[in-house]
Interface confidence: low
């Protein structure tokens, strides 16, 4: 019969014949022959292969380096790599999460719209009229101005996006 020029899924062509690929979590030890199956071996501890493959070496699990602010989010298996994330207060510099940077703080006049996660930075928004923020924070939202009326007081000093209103007593009308 004619030697094959293409093989089925999960097979590969070698020496004019189709051999089975090694399953995820295993590496290739020796190709199949006319008489023997492909020989595969499981990856060692701290190693993985995540596809059907003909690799002769497994990949090392990613190291989540605490010196770069990283910690393990999900431990690797023989079929999956370790997933790193950042310590609280930090976020990944890339999708691969190879290092971490400090979460941004929202300046006075801005509040936190969305608190940062392990993979995304703080999202800030300007405090709208009626709200203020007088701190630089990675957590604080804009606060509403104090309602002087509900305290039977009057506004003595208008609020801004960075300061609360100042309330004071109502002027008493003389009899």
């Amino acid at each position: 019969p004619e030697p094959p020029t293409a093989c089925r899924e999960k097979q590969y062509l070698i020496n004019s014949q189709c051999c089975s690929l090694c399953q995820p979590g295993q590496k290739l030890v020796s190709d199949c022959t006319e008489f023997t199956e492909t020989e595969c071996l499981p990856c060692g501890e701290s190693e993985f292969l995540d596809t059907w493959n003909r690799e002769t070496h497994c990949h090392q699990h990613k190291y989540c380096d605490p010196n770069l602010g990283l910690r393990v989010q999900q431990k690797g298996t023989s079929e999956t790599d370790t997933i790193c994330t950042c310590e609280e207060g930090w976020h990944c510099t890339s999708e691969a999460c190879e290092s971490c940077v400090l979460h941004r703080s929202c300046s006075p006049g801005f509040g936190v719209k969305q608190i940062a996660t392990g993979v995304s930075d703080t999202i800030c928004e300007p405090c709208p009229v009626g709200f203020f923020s007088n701190v630089s924070s990675a957590f604080e939202k804009c606060h509403p101005w104090t309602s002087c009326e509900t305290k039977d007081l009057v506004v003595q000093q208008a609020g801004t996006n960075k300061t609360d209103v100042v309330c004071g007593p109502q002027d008493r009308l003389r009899a």
Epitope: L68, G69, S99, C100, V101, L102, H103, S105, S136
Partner: nanobody, 121 residues
Framework: EVQLLESGGGLVQPGGSLRLSCAAS????????MMWVRQAPGKGLEWVST????????YYADSVKGRFTISRDNSKNTLYLQMNSLRAEDTAVYYC??????????????WGQGTLVTVSS
């Protein structure tokens, strides 16, 4: 020109306290995270602590956590390190550094001349 000038080191008994200061000049202090690093005799540089731009977030090496407190006063362009419950292994030259990579302990482009802390009975 960027300058960082540490002070406050000295000889202290185990269990004692010291407060280090670092006066910064030549750059906009509040725009930078700042850090303390130290070098024990015959050893390499060891990261100690980092503080965010406005002092709202602080980080510490496990070896000093609960004993050291980093703080800053942006109005005075000064960084501080309060060191309590000092141990012999805290003996080192302490440097303050301008943390330019915005990483917890990921590099610095300027540091001072250092102040020596000796913990001994």
């Amino acid at each position: 020109e960027v300058q960082l000038l540490e002070s406050g080191g000295g000889l202290v008994q185990p269990g004692g306290s010291l407060r280090l200061s670092c006066a910064a000049s030549g750059f906009t202090f509040s725009h930078y995270m700042m850090m303390w690093v130290r070098q024990a005799p015959g050893k390499g540089l060891e990261w100690v602590s980092t503080i965010s731009h406005f002092g709202d977030i602080t980080y510490y090496a496990d070896s000093v956590k609960g004993r050291f407190t980093i703080s800053r006063d942006n109005s005075k362009n000064t960084l501080y390190l309060q060191m309590n419950s000092l141990r012999a292994e805290d003996t080192a030259v302490y440097y303050c550094a301008k943390n330019d990579m915005v990483m917890k302990n990921g590099g610095f482009d300027y540091w001072g001349q250092g102040t020596l802390v000796t913990v001994s009975s």
